[in-house]
Structures are given as C-alpha cells and as structure tokens.
C-alpha cells in the first residue's frame, strides 16, 4: 500500500437515516478522508462526543473527516451528525491496523481501495441518498387520495428494495386498485386510499453487504365536514419594490362550498384592534371558490401605503379559517433588496 493511498467512503452523498455502524481498519501513517453529506450542507464530525475542529491534523471540515496521518490515538468511534437536526449520518469506528511499512499480503479489503484500480468503489452497504425527502414519517391523507412513499438509496452492489405492510411482505394483491412499485424510483404508490390501507409501511433495502429499513405510517382520514383548509405557507410573506406588481396566493380546500375574502389590516385612530379585540380590516376582494382567480390577490403598481398585513379568510357552513402574510415595500433605489422573500408565517 502506497503512503499516498487514502481510506475513503464514496460517493459523497448523505447516507442512511438509520446508518448501520461500520468498522474501518486503518494502517498507521495512512491518510483518511471520510465523507458525510454534501459539502454545502454536510454534517459535523464528532469523536467520542467532542466536535472536531475545522483545522489541525485531525479535522472535521465541510462534511469531511480528514486525518493527515493515522496514529494510534486516532482510533475510536466517530459520528457525523446532520447540520441542524442531529440525525446520525455516519457512525463508524476506526481501528488501528498494521503500519504502512509492514507487509500487506493479507490486508482487509474493506480498509482501503485497491491501488491497482483507483477508480473502483469499495463494497458499501445500502444508504439513503436523500434522507431529507424521508423526514415526513406520518402521512395522514383523506380517503380517495394518492399516497407515494419513497426510499431513495444506493450502495455497492446496487441494492434491491422490497416493501412490508405491518411487518408482512406487501405486493398489493389484496388491495382494490393494487399498487405501483417503481423500483428505479425506489417508490410505492397507492391510488384512492381507503381506511383499510392504514398501517406501517416499511421499505427494506438490501445488498450483499447489508440492509437498511425505514418505516412510514399511513393514516387514512375518512371524509367529514370541516371548515376550509388553507395550504400551509400561503399567502407567503413578500418583499416588493415601489411600482412593481405583487400577487398573493391562497390555496383553499373545502368539501362544503367555501366563500373567500381578502382583507388588509388597517389602523384607525392609531390602533390596529377594535374594542371587541378584533383587528380593523378592509375587504379587498370577496367571492365564491368557483369565481375565477379568487385565490389570487393582485396588487398593481404598489406604493409604500400598500405595505402591511394581508389575510386570506375562507369560510363555509362549518366554520372559518384564515392565514396572513406581510407585504414589505421597499423604495426603488434601495440597493439591498433581493427577490428572496422570507418564509411564510401563518396563524392557527
């Protein structure tokens, strides 16, 4: 083994949400570079509970664990936690092997890449390639809707995927309408769900090296009268320049015929609220859901006076729902303005 040869985990994608513990044997003096997540949102590396600094002989940097030259004290347990969520992306133990100067006739093939084929990948247990797309564990959907579960994965050799329902092999043969399995998309699709579809759905991803699994919970909601449901995040907070046009969007879902109003919050005699505790508002637009484009509020040629809080109010025979957003209007010459609006906020 040449001294320049490195221990690497590749490709550099975010691995499993339920990462299997790995052991890697590393020769003394050998450089190590282990990957954890994509560079722009990579994880942070910790050894025995302490975060690795971004500089030094052993460093955690932009999602990589780098050891310039492996020493006995570098052996131990290393964890990579996803930025912001503390989800374990990598969980591995580095074990000290023979030094680089010793014979390597019977070296562990898992410990490094074959120098005669520098572009071959080592065998690798399955891992999730897009764990962020799997964060929604509980799916509560109305009866009649379509449900799609995805478990995108990779590994070497390429793993296979199979599905379980409540712990039993699931092929959909007893399900009216059946199921669609799209192995190339690592997905399970069920159309027109009914209450009997409720349960725990497990994707099981396997190859010769190992297996990983992930559970989704499906709850099917039987349709019942309810007040209108407004799509989360709409209307969205918006920033605009004086003179520009603005569209505020409100998505309304309702079994019963809904009635929609767009309101602007106003101030009267220096107060935003009346004696009854309700806000002062001006009705800008009102219509039934089947009126054209009632779910969009158009504001043309906005001025500073248009800034403020706007509310989409939807009502039906059962009750009312509303969500609000803020419009910020900047002067034309403001050089700090960017088109990126902040995240939507909404009332409950």
């Amino acid at each position: 083994l040449e001294a320049s040869e490195e221990v690497e985990l590749e490709p550099c994608l975010a691995p499993s949400l339920e990462q299997q513990e790995q052991e890697l044997t590393v020769a003394l003096g050998q450089p190590v570079r282990l990957c954890c997540g994509r560079a722009e949102r990579g994880g942070h590396w910790y050894k025995e509970g302490s975060r690795l600094a971004p500089a030094g002989r052993v460093r955690g940097w932009r999602g990589r664990l780098e050891i310039a030259s492996f020493l006995p004290e570098d052996a131990g347990r290393y964890l990579c936690l996803a930025r912001g969520s503390m989800i374990v992306l990598q969980n591995l133990t580095l074990i000290t092997g023979d030094s680089l100067t010793s014979s390597n006739d019977d070296e562990d093939p898992k410990s490094h890449r074959d120098p005669s084929n520098r572009h071959s990948y080592p065998q690798q247990a399955p891992y999730w390639t897009h764990p962020q797309r799997m964060e929604k564990k509980l799916h509560a959907v109305p009866a009649g809707n379509t449900v799609k579960f995805r478990c995108p994965a990779a590994g070497n050799p390429t793993p296979t995927i199979r599905w379980l329902k409540d712990g039993q092999a699931f092929h959909g043969e007893n399900r009216i309408g059946g199921i669609r399995l799209r192995h190339q998309h690592w997905s399970l699709v069920m159309e027109s769900v009914v209450p009997s579809d409720r349960g725990t759905y497990t994707c099981l991803v396997e190859n010769a090296v190992g297996s990983i699994r992930y559970n989704y919970l499906l709850d099917v909601l039987e349709r019942s009268p309810h007040r209108p449901i407004l799509q989360a995040g709409l209307p969205a907070n918006t920033t605009a320049v004086v003179g520009s046009d603005v569209e505020l969007l409100c998505k309304v879902y309702s079994d019963a015929q809904p009635h929609i109003q767009w309101l602007k919050h106003i101030v009267i005699n220096g107060s935003s609220f009346g004696a009854d505790g309700f806000p002062y508002v001006q009705v800008l637009k009102t219509a039934d859901i089947n009126s054209s484009e009632v779910e969009v509020l158009y504001l043309r040629n906005v001025s500073a006076e248009d800034a403020g809080e706007y509310t989409c109010l939807a009502g039906n025979s059962i009750g009312l729902s509303y969500q609000s957003a803020w419009l910020t209007v900047l002067p034309e010459e403001d050089p700090t303005w960017t088109a990126a609006a902040p995240e939507a906020r909404y009332t409950d």
Epitope: H44, G84, S85, M86
Partner: antibody, heavy 114, light 107 residues
Framework: QVQLVETGGGVVQPGTSLRLSCAGS????????MHWVRQAPGKGLEWMAL????????FYADSVKGRFTISRDNSKNTLYLQMNSLRAEDTAVYYC????????????WGQGTM | DIQLTQSPSSLSASVGDRVTITCQAS??????LNWYQQKPGKAPKLLIY???NLEIGVPSRFSGSGSGTDFTFTISSLQPEDIATYYC?????????FGGGTKLDIK
C-alpha cells in the same frame, strides 16, 4: 397529550450526587434525541447534554463533562441525568427537552425541576 | 464553540409598538437558529425555528429573519401578553448554545 415530566430535584451538599429523571409520554420516545437544559436563578438558558435515540451516543457541555452522565431507558420512556461532585454553581432549574419536529428546535419541554 | 450575542439585554416598549431583537453568531450557522419565549416560572416556548419559520399555533405578529451570522426577531405589534424574556438558540452543531436573553417589558 405530548409531555415531559422531570423529577428528582432537591437540596444537597456540595460534593454529593443527585439523579434527575424525565418521563416522556404522548410521542415515540425511543425515536427522539433527548436533551437537558438548565437555568441558574435569574440567569439565562444553558444547554448541558444530549443523548441520541441509540442510547449510547452522548454529548456534553464543557461545564459538566466528566461530572454529569446522561442516559435513557427507552423501555420506560425515561431520560436520566446523574450529577456527581455537585457544586454551588450547579444550582438551577433543570429542564429536559426534545425536538419532535426533528429539526433541532426544542418544541417540547418539561416543567423543570429545581 | 459557537457564541450567540443577543441585543439588547433589556427593552421597554409600548403596546402596539414594533419590537426588534438581534442575535449575532460567532460563526456561520446557516439558518439553524431558533427563538424562544420564556415567562417567569415557566419553561421556554418555541416561537420561530430555522430562523424564519413560525411554529404552529404562534401568532403571526412574531417573525424572524436572517442567515449566516446575523439574525433578527420581530414583534410587529406588541401585546401585553408578550411580556417575557426572549432567547435565540443555535442548532447548527454541538455544543448547542443560547443567547444571553432579552427581557421585554411594557412602558
């Protein structure tokens, strides 16, 4: 309903030990990372320790490393904090907390134990 | 370790006022910053997560913005029930850390 309830607080002498417990209910305790946060009288919040759902991955603030041990029993839905070599400056309200949203924000807190 | 500097440490405002609190991180933490409200004798309550997302059930007068090292928390129209201490907290990496807090009261 989702809740965390801490117990085990009390008055002790410097140099002695105390164990706090935190019982979780209404959520899947075994899938959640659990934290301890403390607040000295009239002071701000201080993060102290985290234990991941595997029960073996622990992380500590420097101020308590080596003296405090976080642990959990998923079969009992309970989190623990073993506090040894206690000092006067450890006087505080101790909260257990978790992130049900999975995004690192503490969206569930216990009521605290002194 | 990441330090969070919160300012001001205390603040008096009138009902209906727009209130702004800032939080500065000692290094880039992307958008991994949360804001909490704590009333005397109570546990903290999450208001804003990931810099700008309003926690479910929190009134829309509360908002947050910022990314990298500089963050802002705003109450658009102060209400009497908003009297409390407010804390920022980073969850980019461990050890987690909180700002020193901002005590807000009514003039």
């Amino acid at each position: 309903q989702v809740q965390l309830v801490e117990t085990g607080g009390g008055v002790v002498q410097p140099g002695t030990s105390l164990r706090l417990s935190c019982a979780g209910s209404g959520f899947t305790f075994s899938e959640s990372g659990m934290h301890w946060v403390r607040q000295a009288p009239g002071k701000g919040l201080e993060w102290m320790a985290l234990i991941l759902n595997d029960g073996i991955s622990n992380f500590y603030a420097d101020s308590v490393k080596g003296r405090f041990t976080i642990s959990r029993d998923n079969s009992k839905n309970t989190l623990y904090l073993q506090m040894n070599s206690l000092r006067a400056e450890d006087t505080a309200v101790y909260y257990c907390a978790s992130s049900l949203g999975g995004n690192g924000a503490f969206d569930i807190w216990g009521q605290g134990t002194m | 370790d990441i330090q969070l500097t919160q300012s001001p440490s205390s603040l008096s405002a009138s009902v209906g006022d727009r209130v702004t609190i800032t939080c500065q991180a000692s290094q880039d933490i992307s958008n991994y910053l949360n804001w909490y409200q704590q009333k005397p004798g109570k546990a903290p309550k999450l208001l804003i997560y990931d810099a700008s997302n309003l926690e479910i059930g929190v009134p829309s007068r509360f908002s947050g913005s910022g990314s990298g090292t500089d963050f802002t928390f705003t109450i658009s129209s102060l209400q009497p029930e908003d009297i409390a201490t407010y804390y920022c907290q980073q969850h980019d990496n461990l050890p987690l850390s909180f700002g020193g807090g901002t005590k807000l009261d009514i003039k």
